[in-house]
């Protein structure tokens, strides 16, 4: 139970995550005009990742986008590569961790498909998350950067006689979106890896056979599982409650494969 | 099509208040500020400043910080200026005028005559 | 605040001709964001409301005659009538419409023949 509850959980935060993500992407607000300590202009500068804009007093906002491909800033091509391989990973992690989440049956789905699925999922939710971290960390470091250099040369003029003022930007609302939703998607894929864990068989029925040189006798195992006789695995056993009992007879136990995991 | 009608001329003694209104009709009355602009007789424009007509946030120039106010009533579609403790250089034509592109003023009211006189 | 100087403050020409009248601001009123100047241009005859003709230094406002025309950017503007008409005798305002608060200039006056 805890463990389909922490694989949907971490499903479900994904999920709230990478719409952030793709929220963050779109926003325009990446960077918005400084207001602080700056002439009051009835004109406000934003900018995105795909377009920039501008809101007049007058309540008219005009937007341009960036139609050139080769003139834009390394920097900034390389935040929306960022951005966009975080939405791409997410998606596809979302629709993989769709088919392994537990309250959903697939035909005959065994655990350990959807516990790899699970895993699976949870990997890309967190190379995800981390591209959008990155992404909007490596904008918001450029930003800083040209900030101070702006603030340096806050007033260029032309012999002190003409004042052209420049404008410096700070960081906008998508930053702040960006960063919790890439820390989301995060938690929900560590979410999953956990899930992961539990969704995996720990123990085969192997564990309730015990194996002698001599002879072909059976060991039960007090509220395991069923007896199962000789080195035939019965793999539609279910187990029902291991009370963790070992009789002395108990020799050897074969791991299982996801032990390890 | 867009209008701004303005009340008529008003005669006041100095110390009196006056409120002056704006009638908009024509467009969506929160979706765009309202400025006033004052014109003494023969002399040149004044920007007196603009009222956010959707959130009623107002904006004054520095002159006219004070005794001016600035309000609007949106059932009404209607701004108004209100001036406190008027004074002889109170004398003027107010012009309301809505804001657009660029921040430029495409419509204007007629203007009212405000005459302070003793 | 932001200083708006008109010159010349008086323009005489007969009708035909073609007239330009300057408009400079204390500081520069080009917006970085959209590359656009927030300077208007206004004509006011006797006893009327300003009318607008110019927005953004250049952009002629819907029903203008194609005979103004603004340009200039920073803080330097320029209205030019290509062919000055009888009906154009007016007094000519520029506006700051960059900063707070939006001054005008103190206007130019063109007298026709």
């Known amino acids: 139970m805890a463990v389909t509850a922490c694989q949907g959980l971490g499903f479900v935060v994904s999920l709230i995550g990478i719409a952030g993500i793709i929220a963050a992407t779109c926003m325009d607000q990446w960077s918005t005009q400084d207001l602080y300590n700056n002439p009051v202009t009835a004109v406000f500068n934003y900018q995105g990742l795909w377009r920039s804009c501008v809101r007049e007093s007058s309540g008219f906002t005009e937007c341009r986008g960036y139609f050139t491909l080769l003139g834009l800033p390394a920097m900034l091509q390389a935040v929306r590569a960022l951005m966009i391989v975080g939405i791409v990973l997410g998606a596809i992690g979302l629709l993989v961790s769709i088919f392994a989440l537990k309250c959903i049956r697939i035909g005959s789905m065994e655990d350990s498909a959807k516990a790899n699925m699970t895993l699976t999922s949870g990997i890309m939710f967190i190379v995800s998350g981390l591209c959008a971290i990155a992404g909007v960390s490596v904008f918001a470091n450029m930003l800083v950067t040209n900030f101070w250099m702006s603030t340096a040369n806050m007033y260029t003029g032309m012999g002190g006689m003409v004042q052209t003022v420049q404008t410096r930007y700070t960081f906008g609302a998508a930053l702040f979106v960006g960063w919790v939703a890439g820390g989301l998607t995060l938690i929900g894929g560590v979410m999953m890896c956990i899930a992961c864990r539990g969704l995996a068989p720990e123990e085969t029925n192997y564990k309730a056979v015990s194996y002698h040189a001599s002879g072909h006798s059976v060991a039960y195992k007090p509220g395991g599982f069923k007896a199962s006789t000789g080195f035939g695995s019965n793999t539609k056993n279910k187990k029902i409650y291991d009370g963790g009992a070992r009789t002395e007879d108990e020799v050897q136990s074969y791991p299982s494969k996801h032990d390890y995991v | 099509q867009i209008q701004l009608v303005q009340s008529g001329p008003e005669l006041k003694k100095p110390g009196e208040t006056v409120k002056i209104s704006c009638k908009a009709s024509?467009?969506?009355?929160?979706?765009?500020?309202m400025n006033w602009v004052k014109q003494a007789p023969g002399k040149g424009l004044k920007w007196m400043g603009w009222?956010?007509?959707?959130?009623?946030?107002?904006t004054y120039a520095d002159d006219f910080k004070g005794r001016f106010a600035f309000s609007s009533e949106t059932s009404a579609r209607t701004a108004y200026l209100q001036i406190n403790n008027l004074k002889n250089e109170g004398m003027a034509t107010y012009f309301c005028?809505?804001?657009?592109?660029?921040?430029?003023?495409?419509?204007w009211g007629q203007g009212t005559l405000v005459t302070v006189s003793s | 605040d932001i200083v708006m100087t008109q010159y010349p403050s008086f323009l005489t020409v007969t009708t035909g001709e073609k007239v330009t009248m300057s408009c400079k601001s204390s500081?520069?009123?080009?917006?970085?964001?959209?590359?656009?100047?927030?300077l208007t241009w206004y004509q006011q005859k006797p006893g009327q409301p300003p009318k607008l003709l110019i927005y953004?230094?250049?952009t002629r406002e819907s029903g203008v005659p194609d005979r103004f025309a603004g340009s200039g950017s920073g803080t330097d503007f320029t209205l030019t009538i290509s062919s000055v008409q009888a009906e154009d005798l007016a007094i000519y305002y520029c506006?700051?419409?960059?900063?707070?608060?939006?001054?005008f200039g103190s206007g130019t006056k063109l007298e026709v023949k």
């Open positions: 500081q520069s009123l080009l917006n970085s964001g959209n590359q656009r100047n927030y």
């Open positions: 506006q700051n419409n960059y900063f707070y608060p939006f001054t």
């Open positions: 024509g467009y969506t009355f929160t979706n765009y500020g």
């Open positions: 005028a809505r804001s657009y592109n660029g921040n430029s003023l495409p419509y």
């Open positions: 953004w230094a250049s």
């Open positions: 009222i956010n007509t959707y959130t009623g946030e107002s």
